[in-house]
């Protein structure tokens, strides 16, 4: 019986630790995509609707804030698209990029953790264009550090929740 109790306590402890593991999956807020043709910061994301969820992390002022030290897997998926019904591209040569940036408040500094993308030729002869970027990596993050996303040409972002999103989940503690 003691073993049974110990086992169930162990399960409970494991489960509560898992439930406390920080994670976030943020999807683009399509009603508030900024304008610009150069690199801009995407600050409007959903954290509690559709596929978007957050636990033991904080989303504030367009940034994902780390609440627990640890090693985290960070990921971002950004889709760009253009259909001729919305008009013409003013230029057919495009640099379509995403930058995942870490900002530290304690020691004011900013670092690009990941970047991805390509230069594209989107010919005016085509009715539809699409390009997707996915980046992911494993990083040591400290409590209070902030993760943000920057993109080029935000007017070409695909606003669907399955197209433009980013997130993080803690994988292990820092020893």
């Amino acid at each position: 019986e003691k073993a049974m109790v110990d086992g169930s306590w162990l399960d409970l402890a494991k489960r509560s630790k898992l439930e406390a593991q920080p994670f976030a999956h943020l999807t683009i807020n399509a009603t508030d995509i900024p304008s610009g043709s150069h690199k801009v910061s995407l600050s409007s994301w959903y954290h509690d609707r559709g596929w978007a969820k957050i636990s033991n992390m904080t989303f504030s002022n367009g940034k994902l804030i780390v609440n627990q030290d640890g090693f985290y897997y960070l990921y971002a998926n950004i889709c760009f698209r253009h259909h001729e019904t919305s008009g013409d591209l003013a230029t057919e040569y495009l640099q379509l990029m995403v930058y995942v940036t870490k900002t530290s408040i304690k020691i004011p500094s900013s670092h690009t953790l990941m970047k991805g993308g390509s230069t594209k030729y989107w010919s005016g002869n085509s009715e539809f264009h699409f390009y997707s970027i996915n980046v992911g990596g494993f990083f040591k993050l400290r409590s209070g550090e902030e993760i943000s996303i920057e993109v080029s040409n935000p007017s070409l972002l695909d606003p669907d929740q399955d197209a433009t999103y980013f997130g993080a989940f803690k994988v292990r503690d820092i020893d």
């Epitope: 304008s35 610009g36 043709s37 253009h82 001729e84 019904t85 919305s86 008009g87 013409d88 591209l89 003013a90 230029t91 057919e92 495009l94 040409n153 935000p154 007017s155 070409l156």
Partner: antibody, heavy 126, light 103 residues
Framework: QVQLVQSGAEVRKPGASVKVSCKAS????????IHWVRQAPGQRLEWMGW????????KFSQKFQGRITVTRDTAASTAYMELRSLRSEDTAVYYC???????????????????WGQGTLVTVSS | EIVMTQSPSSLSASVGDRVTITCRAS??????LNWYQLKPGKAPRLLIY???SLQSGVPSRFSGSGSGAEFTLTISSLQPEDIATYYC?????FGQGTKVEIK
């Protein structure tokens, strides 16, 4: 205030060319595209082409491809449309119009013509 | 190539009447539709863009609605100065126009 002022009426013989100017004022010329649209007597409006005043990129209707040239002089804030090999059916009022999409804020020419020139009547007759 | 079709081609109404003009696209164009007013000898004027957004300076009696392939321009109370030809437009394609006259 935003204004587009076009050159005066022209009369041309078939086979000749015509060049219409469109002087912009009241905004940063380089940040917008200029479209050319015409209306022949009793006909609907007809889009001819655009020029991105910032980088000079152009796009034309298939119908006018090879006969039309659109240029701009950023120092003079002026766009020009030249139509060659004129025929009688080119008799029309030619308009320039600004696209309301600001190229600094995005890269899509949206075909929303928010300001128009007063029109230039081009008559092609032998 | 998308074709825009307007109806009616002309209409006659009294001052104060509610006037509705319809525009159909040959395929779905989402909400990318604009309306213009043309008066003889004057520069055309953008009234509505993006199907329902009122261009600044345009009287509120003008309104637009619709999405997909069917759109309407409504003048809630026709005024003498509204005598003109009205055109719908999607990118490179214009409707054939609707001439509005006063009875």
């Amino acid at each position: 205030q935003v204004q587009l002022v076009q050159s005066g009426a022209e009369v041309r013989k078939p086979g000749a060319s015509v060049k219409v100017s469109c002087k912009a004022s009241g905004y940063d010329f380089s940040n917008y595209a200029i479209h050319w649209v015409r209306q022949a007597p009793g006909q609907r409006l007809e889009w001819m082409g655009w020029i991105n005043a910032g980088n000079g990129n152009t796009k034309f209707s298939q119908k006018f491809q090879g006969r039309i040239t659109v240029t701009r002089d950023t120092a003079a804030s002026t766009a020009y449309m030249e139509l060659r090999s004129l025929r009688s059916e080119d008799t029309a009022v030619y308009y320039c119009a600004r696209d309301r999409s600001n190229m600094v804020r995005g890269i899509i020419i949206a075909y929303y013509f928010d300001y128009w020139g007063q029109g230039t009547l081009v008559t092609v007759s032998s | 190539e998308i074709v825009m079709t307007q109806s009616p081609s002309s209409l006659s109404a009294s001052v104060g009447d509610r006037v509705t003009i319809t525009c159909r696209a040959s395929q779905s164009i989402s909400r990318y539709l604009n309306w213009y007013q043309l008066k003889p000898g004057k520069a055309p004027r953008l009234l509505i863009y993006g199907a329902s957004s009122l261009q600044s300076g345009v009287p509120s009696r003008f309104s637009g609605s619709g999405s997909g392939a069917e759109f309407t321009l409504t003048i809630s109370s026709l005024q003498p100065e509204d005598i003109a030809t009205y055109y719908c437009q999607h990118t490179r394609a214009f409707g054939q126009g609707t001439k509005v006259e006063i009875k």
